[in-house]
């Protein structure tokens, strides 16, 4: 008949499993339960995947690994206390009197329940990495954490290479024994110990459970250290940078931590497993029963097969590891799970020209000299598209791409952003907003939804802010509907008249040149260069200013560059920026200074793109450590990451305007990095490429 083979990870667990099997058999519970001995949770997962065992209870981190690497699914969950159900919450606690926030944890003293523990280590460290606050080079999480905090107590870190920093705040027992032990010998061990570390002023932040503060304050704790503590003297750090009362843990936490769950192979019937265990818990979970499913006391251990604090087992409806873990915990695990043994020794960078090969070679040497990991290798390709193909084919690992190329890399080749460039505000030519500018006119005001029949001014055919984005956006929003992919005709029919300067006017609709004026002599009308006075962003704005058009599609800087005395040409000399407004996608109008909130799209910064199976945190970790050494254009370390002048080129490997590489944070897909408006505009245009 059918049998379920439970995997036990130790002798005591094997003992308890044997007793459970016997108890179930005597009670006539079907299918029969057998026990298989594994050496660890990891080993058991491998046995289950290999069909040599069927089930095991795992914690969140192990469920993530089992699901991601071996395709196992959670089918039965543990419940601990009725208030929170099948989860608890990992929180960061600080003294109310301090000024610490989630964004200022660098350099503060930290208290942890123990090394590799869920709320004390895995969640906070994973969250800090995943959110881009903590960069990790070469998977060396311990080093990254020891460099990040200004001293810590992480019980159990004494055996690591970074014990000086990670055990600095630990104090051992009253006689100084057991310093940094992962046991009650260390006074700052476990939930209450980590909180005590904060309460006694040793640390500035404690990573604990949602209930820890309330269980150890307001007279609820017996030990003398907690007698006088008041819960109101502590606050929680929220992910958005704010702080909250300790009772607000449902809204203000680092992650909801899923309960332990029973996992099985994808082809195993989860309902069957639950029926088996449900019969068992009905008979063997209350005091006085011959076998205790949720107690490990008889075996001299804790949490054997199930957590001792389990009050009941429940079926899991959506049997995927992602759904069970939840996005907060899932994200934290992504940041944490980096196996140095599985880290590729090289990061192969895609290069597109001889100068870029030279700069990449120098970068590889400079990084190696500083022992940065992984090492850089340089691999040539013929074009950005060729890079994408080679990355997808696993012949190369990374390349820096522009907005349109990021779109192609993501949509066609499945690549994802691993790091981004950030430019100084003065460098508006590298990343800018596309805006629709109109005259401030209360009597004839119209919105973005009412552009049909208006007169339009464009920098030129094919210009990003003057044509591609606005036309793409209007197509995507359904206002312009090209027939047979004829965008030009559709635009010419949508607007009453336009000026869209062009280099090759063959078969060009006349209405797209109707507003153009040419040069001072009236020649060169509608040409795609500065002989046409309405050419370019300045010209498109002039077209609006001189009342030729009703709307100008330009960059967010254009109005400022040509008003308030910033342009002394006669047509612009007396213009005031307050006489113009922006049309917003939501139908409103806004001041020209509100471009960040009221625009058609932002032309995004360049990003480093990689395969989705590449660990993006190791890529950013490498670039972040590298930019500390080589990011400043005046550094004396022998290489300049963001400068190409030594190679007689421009924008090699990275744009020269880059002031720093940034983590992608939540923008982990090409759509996230590019922004929905920019993607929509590109899709609007690409939908017309027949």
């Amino acid at each position: 008949g059918m049998e379920v083979r439970w995997c036990a990870t130790s002798d005591p667990e094997q003992h308890k499993c044997g007793n459970m099997s016997e108890a179930f058999r005597e009670a006539g519970i079907q299918p029969s339960l057998l026990c298989v001995r594994g050496t660890s949770a990891d080993h058991c997962v491998q046995l289950i995947a290999a069909q040599e065992a069927d089930a095991i209870t795992l914690d969140g981190g192990a469920i993530y690994e089992a699901g991601k690497e071996h395709g196992l699914k959670p089918v039965v969950g543990e419940v601990y206390d009725q208030e929170v159900g099948t989860s608890y919450y990992a929180v960061a606690v600080v003294r109310r009197s301090s000024h610490v926030t989630i964004d200022t944890l660098k350099g503060v003293k930290s208290c942890h329940t123990g090394i590799n523990r869920t709320v004390g280590w895995n969640v906070p460290v994973g969250y800090l990495v995943e959110s881009g606050r903590l960069s990790v080079m070469g998977c060396d999480v311990l080093k990254a954490v020891s460099d990040y905090f200004g001293g810590s107590c992480v019980p159990g870190a004494g055996e690591t290479s970074y014990s000086e920093s990670l055990c600095r705040l630990c104090r051992g027992d009253s006689s100084g024994e057991g310093v940094c032990d992962k046991s009650p010998l260390e006074r700052y061990y476990d939930y209450s110990g980590a909180f005590r570390c904060l309460a006694e002023g040793a640390g500035d932040v404690a990573f604990v459970k949602h209930s820890t503060v309330l269980e150890n304050t307001d007279g609820k704790t017996l030990p003398s250290w907690g007698q006088a503590l008041l819960s109101q003297d502590f606050e929680l750090l929220c992910r958005d940078g704010s702080r909250a009362d300790v009772t607000e843990w449902r809204q203000c936490h680092l992650a909801r931590v899923p309960a332990h769950a029973v996992v099985v192979r994808a082809d195993t019937d989860g309902g069957l497993i639950f029926r088996l265990l449900n019969e068992g818990q009905r008979l063997f979970s209350h005091e006085g029963s011959s076998f205790q499913m949720f107690s490990s006391e008889a075996y001299g251990q804790k949490d054997l097969l199930f957590k001792d604090s389990t009050s009941e087992l429940v079926p899991i409806a959506t049997q995927t590891y992602e759904a069970w873990l939840g996005h907060e915990y899932l994200h934290a695990m992504k940041g944490l799970l980096c196996d140095p043994n599985r880290l590729p020794p090289y990061l192969r960078w895609c290069v597109l020209s001889t100068p870029e090969i030279q700069k990449c070679g120098d970068m590889a040497v400079a990084f190696r000299r500083q022992r940065l990991k992984p090492e850089i290798q340089c691999v040539s390709a013929k074009s950005p598209q060729h890079c994408m193909e080679r990355i997808q084919a696993e012949q190369v690992d990374a390349v820096t791409l522009s907005g349109e190329d990021i779109y192609t890399a993501g949509k066609t080749y499945g690549l994802v952003p691993a790091a981004g460039e950030h430019y100084a505000p003065e460098d508006s030519s590298n990343s800018y907003y596309v805006v629709a500018v109109v005259r401030r006119d209360s009597s004839h005001a119209f919105t973005l939804d009412e552009l049909r029949g208006k007169r339009s001014c464009h920098a030129g055919f094919g210009s990003p802010a003057g044509w591609d984005v606005p036309v793409g956006a209007l197509i995507q929003r359904g206002f312009i509907r090209p027939k047979d992919c004829d965008v030009l005709t559709a635009v010419s029919e949508f607007f009453n008249a336009s000026c869209v300067p062009v280099n090759n006017p063959k078969n060009y609709p006349s209405s797209l040149c109707a507003l153009c004026v040419g040069d001072e002599q009236g020649r060169n009308k509608c040409v795609g260069n500065s002989q046409e006075r309405y050419y370019g962003y300045r010209g498109a704005f002039r077209c609006l200013v001189e009342n030729a058009g009703d709307v100008a599609f330009v960059r967010h800087t254009t109005v400022f560059d040509n008003t308030n005395g910033h342009n002394s040409e006669p047509w612009a000399a007396e213009l005031r920026s307050e006489d113009y407004e922006l049309l917003c996608p939501n139908g409103a109008r806004a001041e020209v200074s509100q471009f960040a909130a009221c625009n058609l799209a932002q032309i995004p910064p360049h990003a480093v793109m990689v395969r989705p199976d590449t660990n993006i945190f190791t890529v950013y970790g490498l670039l972040d450590k590298a930019q500390d050494l080589f990011g400043d254009d005046h550094n004396k370390n022998g290489f300049k990451m963001f400068d190409s002048s030594n190679y007689h080129g421009q924008d090699l490997l990275f744009k020269d305007a880059t002031v720093r590489a940034v983590p992608v944070g939540e923008k982990t897909t090409y759509r996230g990095w590019l922004g929905l408006d920019y993607v929509a505009a590109l899709e609007g245009m690409s939908s017309q490429q027949c």
Partner: antibody, heavy 119, light 112 residues
Framework: QVQLQESGPGLVKPSETLSLTCTVS????????WNWIRQPPGKGLEYIGY???????YYNPSLKSRVTISRDTSKNQYSLKLSSVTAADTAVYYC?????????????WGQGTLVTVSS | DFVMTQSPLSLPVTLGQPASISCRAS???????????LHWYQQRPGQSPRLLIY???NRFSGVPDRFSGSGSGTDFTLKISRVEAEDVGVYYC?????????FGQGTKLEIK
């Protein structure tokens, strides 16, 4: 009218962390760039860094390893932390705004707060 | 690093007379967008700096028209057509074309 106001302790011990907050009124810190500058007694101005409208930070490389700038948009405040201070960090610390309207010149400044590093 | 050099460092001026301060950058301040991000600040005694001129020659709101700025590339000048008593203080040029933004060492204007 845009106003910026620095606040924080006037005395910090060597090796400790200097913490200052800039409270902004008359504008939102979710637009523009929000900066810290310092001026040692009797000396010139030194740029420390900024936090952008989207929350991205940039730090002067000479101070980068010790600086953190963060913000609390709900309070319209941004903060400076400078760790491991020495007597050389004694200065008047200013917060200031930069926007496109003045081509990212620092158009509005706080009144400054003197921070002395001494044991 | 990127250096801004002002001269003179001290400038005694008679009330009602003109004054001129020079500022030289160690590299061109013309940005790729064509703009020159060179600004001038005034710091009166005991006060915080105040923006006078931005982008070489644009007066900030509320700044008297006796102040003017000029220059291009690497050489820039701040002129005061007729010095008044309230103009006493230190004047700084500053660039933000290159990161980090840097300041000149300051020119102290005093009344003769």
């Amino acid at each position: 009218q845009v106003q910026l106001q620095e606040s924080g302790p006037g005395l910090v011990k060597p090796s400790e962390t200097l913490s200052l907050t800039c409270t902004v009124s008359g504008d939102s810190i979710t637009s523009g760039y929000w900066n810290w500058i310092r001026q040692p007694p009797g000396k010139g101005l030194e740029y420390i860094g900024y936090i952008s409208d989207s929350g991205i930070t940039y730090y002067n490389p000479s101070l980068k390893s010790r600086v953190t700038i963060s913000r609390d948009t709900s309070k319209n405040q941004y903060s400076l932390k400078l760790s491991s201070v020495t007597a050389a960090d004694t200065a008047v610390y200013y917060c200031a705004r930069r926007t496109l309207a003045t081509y990212y010149a620092m158009d509005y400044w706080g009144q400054g707060t003197l921070v002395t590093v001494s044991s | 690093d990127f250096v801004m050099t002002q001269s003179p460092l001290s400038l005694p001026v008679t009330l009602g007379q003109p004054a001129s301060i020079s500022c030289r950058a160690s590299q061109s301040l013309v940005q790729s967008d064509g703009n020159t991000y060179l600004h001038w600040y005034q710091q009166r005694p005991g006060q915080s700096p105040r923006l006078l001129i931005y982008r070489v020659s644009n007066r900030f709101s509320g700044v008297p028209d006796r102040f003017s700025g000029s220059g291009s590339g690497t050489d820039f000048t701040l002129k005061i057509s007729r010095v008044e008593a309230e103009d006493v203080g230190v004047y700084y040029c500053s660039q933000s074309t290159h990161v980090p933004p840097t300041f000149g060492q300051g020119t102290k204007l005093e009344i003769k």
